[in-house]
């Protein structure tokens, strides 16, 4: 990692795997506005490739409530509205950072865990096309 | 929230503003392989809606590192190559959790952010508004 | 929830047959759609044939003439009868279905459902 130069104004830890264990603000800092994926777009019902919205909920992981996207269709829905199926819709996945509660049902002691989720979904084709 | 009962083996929390700021273990739980996007699979190159992916580094964040998606094109592209600009290929996004150094570089002090961040691009219709 | 089971994949000699079978078990409500895709190694996943709920089929190019497909919708059951097989038949075969199901009380009228897949190797 890079190194970072110690600010004296920094809360000190007594932590023996420090930085192993760190203090974490749960009070978010939101760089944007928090929606239901739902009504945040309709690319799911739009997209040539749409998807479902799971809800996964865990209350030992915070966020504790996921949405989880699954494509409709094996293929990709054309202009006329049927499906071509010599195409594939595919589920584009995202590595997120998640905190689980450690040990169990502690309210203020967290792991973090890497999820693996699926945010929607996108039309490929078999072949690779070279666009100039 | 949902109200998680206290353990009697949880670590004890000293701080006023409980549970505002929690101890968060970092050696990271991983429930599937870490990949470079680029090499965990080729959908940013074989979509209709291709994307590329721009990194985005730093070092007052965890992860240091974001990819971000960048649609290729306006339209989408068809099966003989060139691209349909009646369609659009749209950015999905994800917001996303980070954990931001508070007070800046400070090792082992955090807040947690929410950033919203592009994953992919899928190919849309387009939606027509009629004017009367 | 759906689960897609496949069974019947092998060693088999070229100009040989085989057969493959996929169940869908679950909290099935219609399938729309069932068949077969195939992915051999380097390559991209392609389609080899499909069943629709009305009983017409499709198929790839490379396989018509030497695969059929069918299916019993009483088991929720997709068969793929392959015949005159190629080398460049080798590939791992994935049953995949559009179903509309239930799950956690939500009804979603079409998901796509793919099985973990079953190895077909073909010697020359």
């Known amino acids: 990692g890079i190194a970072i130069p110690r600010n004296s104004g920094c809360p000190n830890s007594e932590d023996k795997n420090f930085p192993r264990t760190v203090m974490v603000n749960l009070n978010i800092h939101n760089r944007n506005t928090s929606t239901n994926p739902k009504r945040s777009s309709d690319y799911y019902n739009r997209s040539t490739s749409p998807w479902n919205l799971h809800r996964n909920e865990d209350p030992e992981r915070y966020p504790s409530v996921i949405w989880e996207a699954k494509c409709r269709h094996l293929g990709c829905v054309k202009a006329d509205g049927n499906v071509d199926y010599h195409m594939n819709s595919v589920p584009i996945q995202q590595e997120i950072l998640v905190l689980r509660r450690e040990p169990r049902h502690c309210p203020n002691s967290f792991r973090l865990e890497k999820i693996l989720v699926s945010v929607g979904c996108t039309c490929v084709t078999p072949i690779v096309h070279h666009v100039a | 929230g949902i109200a998680i009962p206290r353990n009697s083996g949880c670590p004890n929390s000293e701080d006023k503003n409980f549970p505002r700021t929690v101890m968060v273990n970092l050696n990271i739980h991983n429930r599937n392989t870490s990949t470079n996007p680029k090499r965990s699979s080729d959908y940013y190159n074989r979509s209709t809606s291709p994307w590329n992916l721009h990194r985005n580094e730093d070092p007052e964040r965890y992860p240091s590192v974001i990819w971000e998606a960048k649609c290729r094109h306006l339209g989408c592209v068809k099966a003989d190559g060139n691209v349909d600009y009646h369609m659009n290929s749209v950015p999905i996004q994800q917001e996303i959790l980070v954990l931001r150094r508070e007070p800046r570089h400070c090792p082992n002090s955090f807040r947690l952010e929410k950033i919203l961040v592009s994953v992919g691009c899928t190919c849309v219709t387009p939606i027509v508004h009629h004017v009367a | 929830e759906v689960q897609l089971v496949e069974s019947g994949g092998g060693l088999v000699q070229a100009g040989g047959s085989q057969r493959l079978s996929c169940t869908a078990s679950?909290?099935?409500?219609?399938?729309?759609?069932m068949g077969w895709y195939r992915q051999a190694p380097g390559k991209q996943r392609e389609l080899v044939a499909l069943?629709?709920?009305?009983?017409?089929?499709d198929y790839a190019d490379s396989v018509k003439g030497r695969f059929t497909i069918s299916r019993d919708n009483a088991k929720n059951t997709v068969y793929l009868e392959m015949n005159s097989l190629k080398a460049e038949d080798t590939a791992v075969y994935y049953c995949?279905?559009?179903?509309?199901?239930?799950?956690?009380?939500?009804?979603?009228?079409?998901?796509?459902?793919w099985g973990q897949g079953t190895q077909v190797t073909v010697s020359s």
């Open positions: 995949a279905a559009e179903i509309g199901y239930y799950s956690g009380g939500t009804y979603y009228s079409s998901e796509a459902h």
């Open positions: 069943i629709f709920s009305g009983g017409s089929a």
């Open positions: 679950g909290t099935i409500v219609n399938i729309h759609v």
